[in-house]
């Protein structure tokens, strides 16, 4: 009957709404987890990069004038 059909349709709509919400929540949870993981990755990489940066700042490169000369003195003397 039409009443039964309407009741079944209403039930199915309710079920689909609930299922959709459950799926969305699950997907949202997964996405949040992935975002959290990505964020953790960024933070970790950031700290790693920061550590490298500070080590470079702390251990300053030798000045260009304080590196090996183009012509070594022994060569210059020999010449």
């Amino acid at each position: 009957s039409e009443a039964e059909d309407a009741s079944l349709l209403s039930f199915m709509q309710g079920y689909m709404k609930h299922a959709t919400k459950t799926a969305k929540d699950a997907l949202s949870s997964v996405q949040e987890s992935q975002v959290a993981q990505q964020a953790r990755g960024w933070v970790t990489d950031g700290f790693s990069s920061l550590k490298d940066y500070w080590s470079t700042v702390k251990d300053k490169f030798s000045e260009f004038w304080d590196l090996d000369p183009e012509v070594r003195p022994t060569s210059a003397v020999a010449a």
Epitope: S55, D59, K60, F61, S62, E63, F64, W65, D66, L67, D68, P69, R72, P73, T74, A76, V77
Partner: antibody, heavy 112, light 112 residues
Framework: QLVESGGGLVQPGGSLRLSCAAS????????MRWVRQVPGKGLEWVSS????????AYRDSVKGRFTISRDNAKNTLYLQMNSLRAEDTAIYYC???????WGQGTLVTVSS | DIVMTQSPLSLPVTPGESASISCKTS???????????FYWFLQKPGQSPQQLIY???NRASGVPDRFSGSGSGTDFTLKISRVKAEDAGVYYC?????????FGQGTRLEIK
């Protein structure tokens, strides 16, 4: 050839001036360094100076106490050491940048 | 500061045999100019250090081809083939890439 002089016994807080006479190469075209060695122990870079003397570099423990300088007309490198401490006791070597050539060293002893 | 860790610290060798010394660094040593300022020295008893190798693998003037340097990154090696009695002494690795320049603690090579 590099010949150091000026080492000796000095009391804590005292001063010394080391000299390094260079010969056999064009002194003014090479940056120079001082390296020290506690007798029987390892080596430690102390300071470096640019060919013209315009640029200098020091290890942290001697900054503000030691001054590196040079006189290219006299082919001589210097290290003025003030406020000397017991831990500055070492043989001080004059070295050409690149560590290719070393002097024989001069001993500095800081003791009361 | 960059830490240079040498091994072994003592190395007994029979004349004619080969010897190998390792130097591990706490950080890579490539300068911003693309070169690696890594060195090996030999200090014989009562003498100043003498340079054997510069920029990882280049032999210094007058150094026999029995001495060879290799390595990259943080691992470097000095190999001495056909060891002679005159090779006895303390071997040091060092770098000049960053301030302060630092040296290894030394490896004593003794002839058996």
């Amino acid at each position: 050839q590099l010949v150091e002089s000026g080492g000796g016994l000095v009391q804590p807080g005292g001063s010394l001036r080391l000299s390094c006479a260079a010969s056999g190469f064009t002194f003014g075209t090479y940056s120079m360094r001082w390296v020290r060695q506690v007798p029987g122990k390892g080596l430690e870079w102390v300071s470096s100076i640019h060919t013209e003397g315009g640029g200098t570099a020091y290890r942290d423990s001697v900054k503000g106490r030691f001054t590196i300088s040079r006189d290219n007309a006299k082919n001589t490198l210097y290290l003025q050491m003030n406020s000397l401490r017991a831990e500055d006791t070492a043989i001080y070597y004059c070295v050409i940048a690149g560590y290719s050539d070393w002097g024989q060293g001069t001993l500095v002893t800081v003791s009361s | 500061d960059i830490v240079m860790t040498q091994s072994p610290l003592s190395l007994p060798v029979t004349p004619g045999e080969s010897a190998s010394i390792s130097c591990k660094t706490s950080q890579g040593l490539v300068h911003s100019d693309g070169k690696t300022y890594f060195y090996w020295f030999l200090q014989k008893p009562g003498q100043s250090p003498q340079q054997l190798i510069y920029q990882v693998s280049n032999r210094a003037s007058g150094v026999p081809d029995r001495f060879s340097g290799s390595g990259s990154g943080t691992d470097f090696t000095l190999k001495i083939s056909r060891v002679k009695a005159e090779d006895a002494g303390v071997y040091y690795c060092a770098h000049g890439t960053y301030y302060p320049h630092t040296f290894g603690q030394g490896t004593r090579l003794e002839i058996k």
